[in-house]
């Protein structure tokens, strides 16, 4: 789960929108029901004829997929309405880096001892941002309305509780899990923040706000300098509204544009080799904004073979401005007074 | 109660586009497939595509499929379906009506009073 | 596409008679078979869903069977209210089609 990990995870979204693995019944390692395939689903609402272009990863096979923006991915397993025709499916390898995973709450102590606050707006990245802006490692969602903050001694002592525990839908967000009764969701407070300096020798860096979409008039800055003589990234997901949502990849040393890409102009889909140590990812959104966003994974890379593409000329990186600085959250009846 | 108000009668040339709209109320209209359905004088009902007003996600007949269009205006909690390169043959009444929640989508359980689109030159 | 036929094409009975439709499907298509009623001028209206379950408040005297091409649609004791068109429309698979529809007239 952790932002420092993304080799382990097989998705990038909060939902699993972009899950595209082969577990094919509702609980992980033969466990749950059988998943029924997609192209024998027409009686329901959703089948490989509802996704021509492949756009959702439907098919002729019976894997776990979500197709409609739901929470997490599913499955169908019963071919008529009689009952539960469908199910969750448990996937273990599906969450995002960045997401820790789904704790107990008791309440006394609280798994999350820094300050907290409710909301019947949450999303998980509302809970982000005023975690961040309190200056805490750690933010947890409980209840689909309550948000936690704290910091990794914290979950040294915490008790994992199933995935599926963490239930329930953000009263923000019909697409998004916000923990459950008793039980916190906790994320790393860098998942969607507007800047950041990346050092560790792999990572995933997010669009700012993200899982949310990201906003209107985001200028945004993350510098990467990972141990190695160059480095590799690979866009898990790129979701920009139009090509006035601009994300610029320059030498850090040189200043100069290595590569740019847009809501016109995606990434490749493979991996793409740079041959700098250091570099600046700049992101801006236009006065419209509002898209998905992108994820994508970093490595160092031992050797500097560039991916042969010549750079784009030069320009000067504005500072980032500084994140969460509008964030509200309503205190939490009976909470300690925010730190 | 739940409802579906179409919009009035329309009359269009030939090679002219019709869109033809449905206010839902009294349920979540995000939540409840939409469909659309026409039936020409004297003939049997002929399905033409749906729409899942939460996300957006369409299903067309292929014998429509190069010419409707079908949208929804989620904060208007409306359904719209466009028909475009009229012909006379498009002379129909064409009904909204609500098909099943979420990934169930099993019947036409509410239907609007229908419209009537003529095509005549 | 799923062809759908309805036998007869009209019919005419007595108040109080027993009334059978028949709905043909080109291919097996399960249960998954809904009936409609339509009334002149006005929209259709569902009486029975995936072949035999009545929609709610419909009266009991409308009824369903069959299952994969062959299916009854049957009305124990017509009366002047159910003078319609009735149309039987599969969901097994895209595009959802109808029948022809029987026109039910009484004598």
């Known amino acids: 789960g952790s932002l420092h990990s993304p080799g382990l995870s097989e998705c990038f979204q909060v939902n699993g929108a972009d899950y595209r693995g082969h577990q094919n019944r509702t609980g992980p390692r033969g466990a749950g029901r059988p998943c029924l395939f997609w192209d024998q689903t027409q009686q329901h609402s959703y089948s490989s004829a509802s996704d021509p272009h492949g756009r959702w990863g439907l098919g002729a096979h019976n894997f776990c997929r979500n197709p409609d923006g739901d929470v997490q991915p599913w499955c169908y397993v019963a071919e008529t309405e009689e009952g539960i025709y469908w199910r969750y499916c448990d996937i273990p390898s599906c969450h995002m880096p960045g997401y820790l995973g789904c704790f107990v709450d008791s309440g006394a102590p609280p798994a999350l001892s820094g300050p907290s606050g409710t909301s019947t707006k949450l999303t998980v990245q509302v809970c982000l941002r005023f975690c961040r802006m309190k200056g805490y490692q750690l933010a947890g969602v409980e209840a689909g309305y309550a948000c936690f903050c704290g910091s990794e001694s914290d979950l040294a002592r915490g008790r994992l509780a199933p995935a599926t525990d963490c239930d329930q839908i953000c009263f923000g967000h019909p697409g998004q899990l916000c923990g459950g009764d008793g039980r916190l969701g906790v994320y790393e407070v860098s998942v969607g923040s507007c800047q950041g300096n990346w050092t560790a020798p792999q990572g995933v860096i997010y669009s700012p706000d993200f899982p949310d979409e990201y906003g209107p008039d985001r200028n945004c800055s993350w510098a990467l300098g990972p141990p190695g003589a160059a480095l590799e990234l690979t866009f898990r997901l790129f979701e920009l509204a139009d090509p006035r949502d601009r994300l610029e990849l320059r030498d850090a040393a040189s200043g100069s544009l290595l590569r740019a890409f847009d809501g016109a102009r995606p990434p490749p889909s493979g991996p793409l080799r740079l041959g700098t140590a250091a570099l600046l990812l700049t992101f801006r959104s236009d006065a419209r904004g509002h898209a998905q966003g992108f994820a994508l994974t970093y490595r160092g890379l031992q050797d500097a073979a560039e991916d042969p593409e010549a750079p784009e000329g030069s320009a000067q990186t504005p500072a980032a401005p500084l994140d969460g600085a509008n964030v509200s959250c309503s205190p939490r009846p009976g909470a300690p007074p925010a730190a | 109660q739940v409802q579906l108000v179409q919009s009035g009668a329309e009359v269009k040339k030939p090679g002219a586009s019709v869109k033809v709209s449905c206010k839902a109320s009294?349920?979540?209209?995000?939540?409840?497939?939409m469909h659309w359905v026409r039936q020409a004088p004297g003939q049997r009902l002929e399905w033409m595509g749906n729409?899942?007003?939460?996300?957006?996600?369409?299903h067309y007949n292929e014998k429509f499929k190069s010419r409707v269009t079908i949208t929804r205006d989620t904060s208007a909690s409306t359904a719209y379906m466009e028909l475009s390169s009229l012909r006379s043959e498009d002379t129909a009444v064409y009904y909204c009506?609500?098909?099943?929640?979420?990934?169930?989508?099993?019947?036409?359980?509410?239907w609007g009073q229908g419209t009537t689109v003529t095509v005549s030159s | 596409d799923i062809q759908m036929t309805q036998s007869p094409s009209s019919l005419s009975a007595s108040v109080g008679d027993r009334v059978t439709i028949t709905c043909r499907a080109s291919?097996?298509?399960?249960?998954?078979l809904n009936w409609y009623q339509q009334k002149p001028g006005k929209a259709p209206k569902l009486l029975i869903y995936?072949?035999?379950r009545l929609h709610s408040g419909v009266p009991s005297r409308f009824s369903g069977s069959g299952s994969g091409t062959d299916f009854t649609f049957t009305i124990s004791s017509l009366q002047p209210e159910d003078i319609a068109t009735y149309y039987c429309?599969?969901?097994?698979?895209?595009?959802?089609?109808f029948g022809g529809g029987t026109k039910v007239e009484i004598k």
């Open positions: 009506t609500r098909g099943g929640y979420g990934k169930g989508d099993w019947y036409f359980d509410v």
């Open positions: 009294g349920y979540t209209f995000t939540s409840y497939w």
């Open positions: 729409i899942y007003p939460g996300s957006g996600i369409t």
């Open positions: 291919q097996d298509i399960s249960n998954y």
């Open positions: 995936y072949t035999s």
């Open positions: 429309q599969q969901y097994s698979k895209l595009p959802r089609t």
